[in-house]
Amino acid sequence: RAVPGGSSPAWTQCQQLSQKLCTLAWSAHPLVGHMDLREEGDEETTNDVPHIQCGDGCDPQGLRDNSQFCLQRIHQGLIFYEKLLGSDIFTGEPSLLPDSPVGQLHASLLGLSQLLQPEGHHWETQQIPSLSPSQPWQRLLLRFKILRSLQAFVAVAARVFAHGAATLSP
């Protein structure tokens, strides 16, 4: 495990996997494509997604003092998104092709969350909101929104692990 007994993680391993997550998150929802969905309505379907905020101890000082607060926050986010990507929103119609980057992204989220989970310790995980679009095509819009927030989340996580690998690795 990466965090034996709740000590520090394998920062370099986490850095590599989080970098891969960033790449996959962008390839699953590239910024430039021949099409994008018209965003309809102002309803914020992804208000409840986890964000890494100032009080989460993910700044350089917070990481030096006690990286566990930040790592717990990242772990919660990874589990949250892993559950969303495994839910009906992504597995239902319209289905994604096998070998889709979304499938690879799902597996990598699980991989990094397992790397962070301390032995014999189970961090509390956030409930995923009930997001059930009324029309199958509305799943497309929901997928876009979830992927956008995931891109932002993994970008911050990757910066945390890059900092940890550079300054906190034994």
Epitope: S27, A28, H29, P30, V32, G33, H34, M35, D36, L37, R38, E40, E93, P94, S95, L96, L97, D99, S100, P101, V102, Q135, P136, W137, Q138, R139, L140, R143, F144, L147
Partner: antibody
């Protein structure tokens, strides 16, 4: 079983209008982009444009923008390709096809209609 | 617009032989966005390969795709009589385009 069934062959005169159809079944028609592809006699394939029936969001190839109109009626799982004024150069086989999702934006065409032959001749 | 150039225009081979078809892009295409189709006379195209190397459902393993950047290849390891057809590559990234096709004919 997923399938796309297109309307029959058409013979038209230059200047006439035309609307051909493509009916989907066996899948959630409104949530897949449906594209149109032209094949001139003895030639290759040309991507014309695409529509998402769920919200009628439409994209055209620059070569076909303003030349044709793509529309859909999700209530009857049907997509359409129409011309307001045909020309002899529009004589071709026209295919509709379902776009699979490789990522959240795009993908290859995994199911195709049988094609509609449009002949424009005076 | 990305232009895809396929070569050769025609490939004359015998059943059992190996066929190598090339598709070259005018600018870099992410390998995730390259597909190959087969079209027989009087029929609609059929998806063979997507993501440059993933076989579509029901496609025999004698068909394989490879390549990245601007150069992509479709290989048919041992030609069967039903494989003689026209093959098209397609990029489905930005404003999708098809290549001009390669005809695989019986020698």
């Amino acid at each position: 079983e997923e399938q796309l069934v297109q309307s029959g062959a058409e013979v038209k005169k230059p200047g006439e209008s035309l609307k051909i159809s493509c009916k989907g079944s066996g899948f959630s028609f409104d949530s897949y982009w449906i594209g149109w592809v032209r094949q001139l006699p003895g030639k290759g394939l040309e991507w014309m444009g695409i529509i998402l029936p769920g919200n009628s969001d439409t994209r055209y190839s620059p070569s076909f923008q303003g030349q044709v109109t793509i529309s859909a009626d999700k209530s009857i799982s049907t997509a359409y390709l129409q011309w307001s004024s045909l020309e002899a150069s529009d004589t071709a086989m026209y295919y509709c096809a379902r776009q699979a999702y490789y990522d959240l934006l795009t993908g290859p065409f995994d199911y195709w209609g049988q094609g509609t032959l449009v002949t424009v001749s005076s | 617009e990305i232009v895809l150039t396929q070569s050769p225009g025609t490939l004359s081979l015998s059943p059992g032989e190996r066929a190598t078809l090339s598709c070259r892009a005018s600018q870099s295409v992410s390998s995730s966005y390259l597909a190959w189709y087969q079209q027989k006379p009087g029929q609609a195209p059929r998806l063979l390969i997507y993501g440059a190397s993933s076989r579509a459902t029901g496609i025999p393993d004698r068909f394989s795709g490879s390549g990245s950047g601007t150069d992509f290849t479709l290989t048919i390891s041992r030609l069967e009589p039903e494989d003689f057809a026209v093959y098209y590559c397609q990029q489905y990234g930005s404003s999708p385009t098809f290549g001009g096709g390669t005809k695989v004919e019986i020698k």
